[in-house]
């Protein structure tokens, strides 16, 4: 009886444990962009390299076709850093004439698409004006935070600029998502 | 039979279970650096306050000698802000001119160091240009990240510019990494 | 007895354990702020959303009057973005003249109120010059770290203006923390 | 605009302790280290120490034995000891910031100190 | 610790002329973190240049540093009435920071 007793008490209170080593996981890294075309007045999502040097996915986290596919629901820890790079702003020009303008900028998004839902629901923004002058820049947008992704939902990297994005360094532009 | 069925069963489920309070774990602050000399053609590394104030290692993993020591093989969320200031950056100057020019650039390095691999890896990167005209500037580079970690890796933070970094304050500058 | 012997042999080894899915967790997103009264020489406080679009807060982490309030003693993992816009800093009026003086800035710190302990303690802070010329500006500061907190602690998000904080979408501006 | 104002004694015997104080207005105190350099007569400069607004310390090696430097942040002040002062240590000693780092923008009027029996 | 020789000891210029000015260290001094500075009698010094190149705040163009290693010179294009003092050299890529002894620009 006591043996009967014990074993429903183990299985209700440890049943929703897991191995941490278990959860699913990826660290993606930035790889050259082709070209391609975008569907009007969206960002274009950044492709990623999944297995080689730093990159990985790991315990049923898939990457493909530009997506991180979440293989089960909880809670997920999300962040991505696109390093960005360009020429003088154009901006330059125009203070010059001494009037001011609507700036420049760069902007990365982190998107969840979800099959049964028609619109994407953006996660993430990071969005910095850029009114350099005289010289060539370059800057990180850092993003992270947690949220709750149901199994099948997928994520993806938005950018407002491909062509400005910096793919040369895996250590640059990356994108990672856990579960907790 | 039955009790005996059941033991190897719970080992083998629950085996990789560990308590969460037991991973290795740390947040590092930012002490005044001592002007030194360092390698040639390599960032210096920063060091840093490991038991004062916000500062704590726990669990193994500890810090020597301007690194942070990985005790333990697994999936590490690793993470850095240095803040940056100086003054007005030269290409105020080279702007005046009309020409085009190399920015002042910082930049944070996150490099992981294998004893057995001769060559330091670059975890992550920040780098950004300054071209700061007519007054001092401040600004913070924000790191993080998932990276799978040997037990025996060592980390560090390196900065382009150990005299540019604001050592004043721990909730400015900090690195540390935990496993997930 | 071997029963005897081998339930508090698990209990020993396995009394730390928890399911992750009920650990505090919260993700606070942007409202828009109303003007009040501050305390002198303190940055003021954000409020935020917790329970509508991409906000939530569960197992026992509460949010109430700008404050998240810690449940349970443990290492927590705290971020927040705040995206910041503006109109051409008066420094470009300075710059004009010739003159140097001390930038515009913008600030966010994330701070902990123990109410054991007369003076809040301030965990993270992002803070950066901005001197635009010539057009309006926007951008983000991003925190994010782990801290040792205790049963009771409250947490809140300081900014340096908060007329200048872009409220105007939850994936801009948000604040969450996670026990690890 | 970030002034630094500093007092103390004058004329010392030697043996005696040099004690100077320095007040910073117009900036902010804890976002800086703040530092004691001395200059003989018609000689160059002597960097003397450092303390942050949470009171960490740098001391040069020659000097560290015989000096104290302490900050109260709610005055905004900084203060320098330096115990068994001799005739060697006559000089105009001068509170300064540092910014960015080990170099200094803003300084004090200068106090000259002289030992002499 | 390192020491800062300068030179010449005095420099006697017109206004209008271009000065040089040398700072030797007796080492080399890491990532080039030297300092120039500016002192006119009775007050305290001025910063001018910084990280052996970069003009402080506020510091017109007319001044300009350079060199690395153990090598390092400050150059004023154009000498004004209010650039005649002492200028001094500071080194701060090894602890102890430490200061040359000066060179005096005088108006000949």
């Known amino acids: 009886l006591k043996g009967q007793e014990f074993a429903p008490s183990h299985q209700q209170v440890y049943a929703p444990l897991r191995a941490d080593g278990d959860k699913p996981r990826a660290h993606l890294t930035v790889v050259r962009q082709t070209p391609t075309q975008h569907f009007k007045n969206q960002f274009p999502a950044l492709h990623w390299e999944h297995e080689l040097g730093l990159a990985f996915t790991k315990n049923r986290m898939n990457y493909t076709n530009k997506f991180l596919l979440i293989p089960e629901s909880g809670d997920y820890f999300i962040y991505s850093q696109v390093t960005f790079r360009g020429m003088t702003s154009e901006c330059s020009e125009i203070r010059r004439a001494g009037r001011p303008n609507k700036p420049d900028s760069i902007t990365v998004v982190i998107t969840k698409v979800t099959d049964s839902y028609p619109e994407p629901t953006q996660l993430l923004m990071g969005t910095k004006s850029v009114c350099e002058v005289g010289s060539n820049w370059f800057q990180p947008i850092y993003l992270g935070a947690m949220f709750s992704l149901q199994e099948g939902d997928k994520l993806m990297v938005n950018v407002s600029d491909i062509s400005l994005v910096d793919y040369t360094k895996e250590d640059k532009t990356f994108f990672g998502a856990f579960l907790l | 039979l039955k009790g005996q069925e059941f033991a190897p069963s719970h080992q083998q489920v629950y085996a990789p279970l560990r308590a969460d309070g037991d991973k290795p774990r740390a947040h590092l602050t930012v002490v005044r650096q001592t002007p030194t000399q360092h390698f040639k053609n390599q960032f210096p590394a920063l060091h840093w306050e490991h038991e004062l104030g916000l500062a704590f290692t726990k669990n193994r993993m500890n810090y020597t000698n301007k690194f942070l020591l990985i005790p333990e093989s697994g999936d590490y969320f690793i993470y850095s802000q240095v803040t940056f200031r100086g003054m007005t950056s030269e290409c105020s100057e080279i702007r005046r001119a009309g020409r085009p020019n190399k920015p002042d650039s910082i930049t944070v390095v996150i490099t992981k160091v294998t004893d057995s691999y001769p060559e330091p890896t670059q975890l992550l990167m920040g780098t950004k240009s300054v071209c700061e005209v007519g007054s001092n500037w401040f600004q913070p580079i924000y790191l993080g990240a998932m990276f799978s970690l040997q037990e025996g890796d060592k980390l560090m933070v390196n900065v382009s510019d150990i005299s540019l970094v604001d050592y004043t304050k721990e909730d400015k500058t900090f690195f540390g990494a935990f496993l997930l | 007895l071997k029963g005897q012997e081998f339930a508090p042999s698990h209990q020993q080894v396995y009394a730390p354990l928890r399911a992750d899915g009920d650990k505090p967790r919260a993700h606070l997103t942007v409202v828009r702020q109303t003007p009040t009264q501050h305390f002198k020489n303190q940055f003021p406080a954000l409020h935020w959303e917790h329970e509508l679009g991409l906000a939530f807060t569960k197992n026992r982490m509460n949010y109430t009057n700008k404050f998240l309030l810690i449940p349970e003693s443990g290492d927590y993992f705290i971020y927040s973005q705040v995206t910041f816009r503006g109109m051409t800093s008066e420094c470009s009026e300075i710059r004009r003249a010739g003159r140097p003086n001390k930038p515009d800035s913008i600030t966010v710190v994330i701070t902990k109120v123990t109410d054991s302990y007369p003076e809040p303690t301030q965990l993270l802070m992002g803070t950066k010059s901005v001197c635009e010329v010539g057009s309006n500006w926007f951008q983000p500061i991003y925190l994010g770290a782990m801290f040792s907190l205790q049963e009771g602690d409250k947490l809140m998000v300081n900014v340096s203006d908060i007329s200048l904080v872009d409220y105007t979408k939850e994936d801009k501006t948000f604040f969450g923390a996670f026990l690890l | 605009q970030v002034q630094l104002q500093q007092w103390g004694a004058g004329l010392l015997k030697p043996s005696e302790t040099l004690s100077l104080t320095c007040a910073v207005s117009g900036g902010s105190f804890s976002d800086y280290f703040w530092t004691w350099i001395r200059q003989p007569p018609g000689k160059g400069l002597e960097w003397i120490g450092e303390i942050s607004h949470s009171g960490r310390t740098n001391y040069n090696p020659s000097l560290k034995s015989r000096v104290t430097i302490s900050v109260d942040t709610s005055m905004s002040q900084f203060s320098l000891k330096m115990t068994s002062v001799t005739a060697a240590d006559s000089a105009v000693y001068y509170c300064?910031?540092?910014?960015?780092?080990?170099?200094?923008?803003?300084w004090g009027q200068g106090t000259l100190v002289t030992v002499s029996s | 610790e390192i020491e800062l020789t300068q030179s010449p000891g005095t420099l006697s210029l017109s206004p209008g002329e271009g000065a040089t000015l040398s700072c030797r260290a007796s080492q080399s001094v890491f990532n080039s973190y030297l300092a120039w500075y500016q002192q006119k009698p009775g007050q305290a010094p001025r910063l001018l240049i910084y990280g052996a190149s970069r003009r402080a705040t506020g510091i017109p163009d007319r001044f300009s540093g350079s060199g690395s290693g153990t090598d390092f010179t400050l150059t004023i294009s154009r000498l004004e009435p209010g650039d005649f003092a002492v200028y001094f050299c500071?080194?701060?890529?090894?602890?102890?920071?430490?200061f040359g002894g000066g060179t005096k620009v005088e108006i000949k």
């Open positions: 300064a910031r540092d910014y960015p780092n080990w170099v200094f923008d803003y």
């Open positions: 500071q080194q701060y890529g090894n602890s102890p920071l430490t």
